[in-house]
């Protein structure tokens, strides 16, 4: 805490300029008027304060606004943000995407900060809804943004926001997360036709159910393997053989390589040996032929 | 993490002249502005003078006209050219770096650097 004291004859501040970058802790806070510093936050991003200063100027804003920040102050805060702590930011009402995006560029190229977080928090929050703008702006600034949500919170994820989304931005979506993505980025392409439906679809495959991919077998996809690496083990194994085959097209030989990985290794357990030895990549491990396959799970149905 | 290395500094009479140099190294990339300080014997540290990234200086009332601060972006050094030095200019002089990005924003300091004005 700075010290209460005079301001020295001569040194109030009339504006907020460079000069203020000579004055010591206890001038600047004896000596800038709170409510002019609010109204010129714009300049202070411009002025090389120390973070010293800065802790001063800070100081004075949440004397200024203790129930938190207007928005107007937030919009300039630029370098002071990185001084604010999540407590400061959820007292904090952020409704313009231009605010978001103006402390957001304050920490760009970085991960994501706490103080980052939580202010995304709030702005989604405030929103309702994570629509395709804000979308749009988060995943400019943070790839992996929309892999950081619960599957809670990407049910808030309207269809139409999907067509932000690059497959980048899914590299680190677990099962959990495409299941509840997958049914939304179908229906937000379903007006497309067949290879550009492939196209936009095949990155949010990880959540398709298994109808979907015998769907898709029928389409001429040549879906390729790390694709197909992707999907959800219990929606691969009750593909057949013949299947895989017109799913994975020209790609269906890198099965050999991957035969001891799920689910390519899964799959193999459930098919004919005979159905694998048609395809001629010597994969082992499928039924004998002469036995026969019980699916206790569709007796237990029945009963 | 940001080092800061000061070298220049002296003895020298008065009227006379010194340069000082500080070259950053590591987290580089984010500087946005480097200054130069001092300290002199019971005295708090003051800003002597300071460069921003684009260029724009300031300086202390006490040391306009005869100080010159510049900065060598390629090189991530600072200078401080010190002319018609003065008794009371005796002092260690650190150099100073504002980071302004995550992870490591703050205010980076040199270990300074002793300049003496004297007869």
């Known amino acids: 805490e700075v010290e209460k004291t005079a301001c020295p004859s001569g040194k109030k501040a009339r504006e907020i300029d460079e000069s203020l970058i000579f004055y010591k802790k206890w001038e600047l806070e004896a000596c800038v008027d709170a409510a002019l510093l609010a109204t010129q936050m714009d300049r202070v991003n411009a002025i090389p304060f120390t973070y010293e200063q800065l802790d001063v100027l800070k100081h004075k804003l949440d004397e200024l606004y203790p129930q938190g920040y207007p928005e107007s102050v937030i919009q300039h805060l630029g370098y002071l943000f990185l001084k604010m702590s999540p407590e400061d930011i959820r007292k904090w009402n952020v409704t313009s995407l231009e605010t978001l995006k103006a402390l957001l560029e304050v920490n760009k190229g970085h991960e994501m900060s706490p103080q980052v977080a939580t202010l995304i928090d709030r702005f989604v929050k405030g929103r309702g809804q994570l629509d395709k703008d804000t979308l749009d702006t988060l995943t400019a600034f943070y790839p992996g943004y929309l892999c950081s949500l619960s599957p809670e919170e990407l049910s808030s994820v309207p269809p139409s926001s999907i067509w932000a989304v690059r497959p980048q931005d899914l590299d680190t979506c677990d099962p959990r997360q495409l299941d509840v993505l997958y049914p939304k980025a179908r229906l937000a392409f379903q007006n497309m036709n067949g290879s550009e439906y492939f196209v936009k679809i095949q990155s949010f495959l990880g959540g398709a159910p298994t109808e979907d991919l015998k769907a898709l077998s029928q389409q001429n996809v040549s879906m390729d393997l790390a694709t197909f690496m992707k999907l959800r083990t219990d929606a691969v194994l009750p593909l057949t053989v013949a299947e895989v085959q017109k799913l994975l097209g020209p790609h269906v030989e890198g099965l050999k390589a991957e035969e001891r990985h799920r689910p390519v290794r899964d799959w193999i357990l459930r098919q004919r040996q005979d159905d694998l030895d048609t395809l001629g990549l010597g994969l082992q491990g499928g039924i004998p032929n002469g036995y026969l396959v019980l699916d206790l799970s569709m007796q237990e149905a029945l009963s | 993490q940001l080092q800061l290395v000061e070298s220049g500094g002296g003895l020298v009479q008065p009227g006379g002249s010194l340069r000082l140099s500080c070259a950053a190294s590591?987290?580089?990339?984010?500087?946005?502005?480097m200054g130069w300080y001092r300290q002199g014997p019971g005295n708090e540290r003051e800003l002597v003078a300071v460069?921003?990234?684009?260029?724009?200086?300031s300086y202390a009332d006490s040391v306009k006209g005869r100080f010159a601060i510049s900065m060598d972006n390629d090189k991530h050094t600072v200078y401080l050219q010190m002319d018609s030095l003065k008794p009371e200019d005796t002092a260690v002089y650190y150099c100073?770096?504002?980071?302004?990005?995550?992870?490591?924003?703050?205010?980076?300091w040199g270990q300074g650097t002793q300049v003496t004005v004297s007869s």
């Open positions: 590591g987290s580089v990339n984010s500087i946005t502005a």
């Open positions: 460069i921003t990234d684009r260029g724009r200086a």
């Open positions: 100073n770096a504002h980071r302004r990005t995550w992870p490591h924003p703050g205010d980076y």
